[in-house]
């Protein structure tokens, strides 16, 4: 039961995380105009990965897409790439994990196959989360650098008397969404990897023998000899007897061919 719960929870957490990564990638507020210690403007500027927007005091909002590809900063391109890789890996991970869920039965899929799929999706979620966190962090670092650069020359003189105010940008909501979402995807991936360990079939050090004494239909299964689960373990090497000492996760709804000798 614990393994199923861990797997299910890992899937749900990753699903929320990936939805968050997608939302963050699409959001326009990656960087927002810094309002602190700045002249009060009648406009509010904010920028995303794909377009920049201006909200006027009337509420009128105008957005312009970045229609150039080569003219964009390399860092922005890198952030875009990291976020897209994160989304793609996460989406594939979700697809794989759906089939890996213990509560879903697909044909006669072996537990070891589900364990492998769970591990694969878990790794994909971890990498997806790391990509998102890296992407958001790179963008945040870019903002911090630009912020202090623009603070150093906040007012750049133009022809002596005339001044132009440089717009400073600070962290937008999308950065926080991205960090949280990346973290959730990462946690979900770790949970899937943990669940994978419990999903793989157990291998005991020796074959248990069933003795049918009169009045007893349950054989004693020695404990404490759990072999370390190999993710690519030989599925033909099955337990001869599976009676009595099952964990809740191992209970099957129909009799196994190994239930009786």
């Amino acid at each position: 039961m614990a393994v199923t719960a861990c797997q299910g929870l890992g899937f749900v957490v990753s699903l929320i995380g990936i939805a968050g990564i997608i939302a963050a990638t699409c959001m326009d507020q990656w960087s927002t105009q810094d309002l602190y210690n700045n002249p009060v403007t009648a406009v509010f500027n904010y920028q995303g990965l794909w377009r920049s927007c201006v909200r006027e005091s009337s509420g009128f909002t105008e957005c312009r897409g970045y229609f150039t590809l080569l003219g964009l900063p390399a860092m922005l391109q890198a952030v875009r790439a990291l976020m897209i890789v994160g989304i793609v890996l996460g989406a594939i991970g979700l697809l794989v994990s759906i089939f890996a869920l213990k509560c879903i039965r697909i044909g006669s899929m072996e537990d070891s196959a589900k364990a492998n799929m769970t591990l694969t999706s878990g790794i994909m979620f971890i990498v997806s989360g790391l990509c998102a966190i890296a992407g958001v962090s790179v963008f945040a670092n870019m903002l911090v650098t630009n912020f202090w650069m623009s603070t150093a020359n906040m007012y750049t003189g133009m022809g002596g008397m005339v001044q132009t105010v440089q717009t400073r940008y600070t962290f937008g909501a999308a950065l926080f969404v991205g960090w949280v979402a990346g973290g959730l995807t990462l946690i979900g991936g770790v949970m899937m990897c943990i669940a994978c360990r419990g999903l793989a079939p157990e291998e005991t050090n020796y074959k248990a023998v069933s003795y049918h004494a009169s009045g007893h239909s349950v054989a004693y299964k020695p404990g404490g000899f759990k072999a370390s689960t190999g993710f690519g373990s030989n599925t033909k090497n099955k337990k001869i007897y599976d009676g009595g000492a099952r964990t809740e996760d191992e209970v099957q709804s129909y009799p196994s061919k190994h239930d009786y000798v």
């Epitope: 105009q33 002249p39 009060v40 403007t41 009648a42 406009v43 500027n45 904010y46 920028q47 920049s52 927007c53 201006v54 006027e56 005091s57 009337s58 509420g59 009128f60 105008e62 312009r64 133009m158 005339v162 001044q163 132009t164 105010v165 440089q166 717009t167």
Partner: antibody
């Protein structure tokens, strides 16, 4: 037809108070920010205050900050400017003007104005 | 505060001739976010409230004749009346629409020569 009608002007002594009103019609009042602008006799235009659609943002000119209070009642399509501690330099024609929606913050419609005279 | 300086203070132009009014701001009115200029021009006839002519430095407001045009960017702006008509006699004001407090120029009085 968009209409803005100011009222409440008059003669007041220095240090006195006055409340100006602006009645709006012909448009959805709650969708627009409104400005107060004044013009002293023979002088140029001077922006006084601005209130956003939902009253969440109110800005004042430094010359009136702490003395004037701007408010609005969207249910009554009305705008108010409460003026206290009035000075001789506040003597002017006061206009309420609508902040245009897509006019780069410019004021697209103006009322006819109401005259405020501060004199002893 | 942004200081708006108009020149000349008054201008006399013959009917049918071109009239040009200049406006300079102490800071750039070009918003970096959308590369748009936040400057408006108003026309005020005697005894009347101002009327919006131009916004965004160059866009004519609805109902404004096409003889009125606005140009310029950053700190230097111009209002041009290509062919002066009798009804254009008025005071013209430029206004900073980017920074609070919103500020106006001192006004330019346009008369017929």
């Amino acid at each position: 037809e968009v209409q803005l009608v100011e009222s409440g002007g008059g003669l007041v002594q220095p240090g006195g108070s006055l409340r100006l009103s602006c009645a709006a019609s012909g448009f959805t009042f709650s969708d627009y920010g409104i400005h107060w602008v004044r013009q002293a006799p023979g002088k140029g235009l001077e922006w006084v205050a601005y209130i956003s659609r939902g009253s969440s943002t109110i800005y004042y000119a430094d010359t009136v900050k702490g003395r004037f209070t701007m408010s609005r009642d969207n249910a009554k399509n009305s705008l108010y400017l409460q003026m206290t501690s009035l000075r001789a330099e506040d003597t002017a024609v006061y206009y309420c003007a609508r902040g245009g929606y897509d006019t780069r913050n410019a004021m697209d419609y103006w009322g006819q104005g109401t005259t405020v005279t501060v004199s002893s | 505060d942004i200081v708006m300086t108009q020149s000349p203070d008054s201008l006399a132009v013959s009917l049918g001739e071109r009239a040009t009014i200049s406006c300079k701001s102490s800071q750039s009115l070009l918003n970096s976010g959308n590369q748009k200029n936040y400057l408006a021009w108003y026309q005020q006839k005697p005894g009347q409230p101002p009327k919006l002519l131009i916004y965004g430095a160059s866009t004519r407001a609805s109902g404004v004749p096409d003889r009125f045009s606005g140009s310029g960017s950053g700190t230097d702006f111009t209002l041009t009346i290509s062919s002066l008509q009798a009804e254009d006699v008025a005071i013209y004001h430029c206004q900073n629409d980017l920074y609070y407090p919103l500020t106006f120029g001192q006004g330019t009085k346009l008369e017929i020569k």
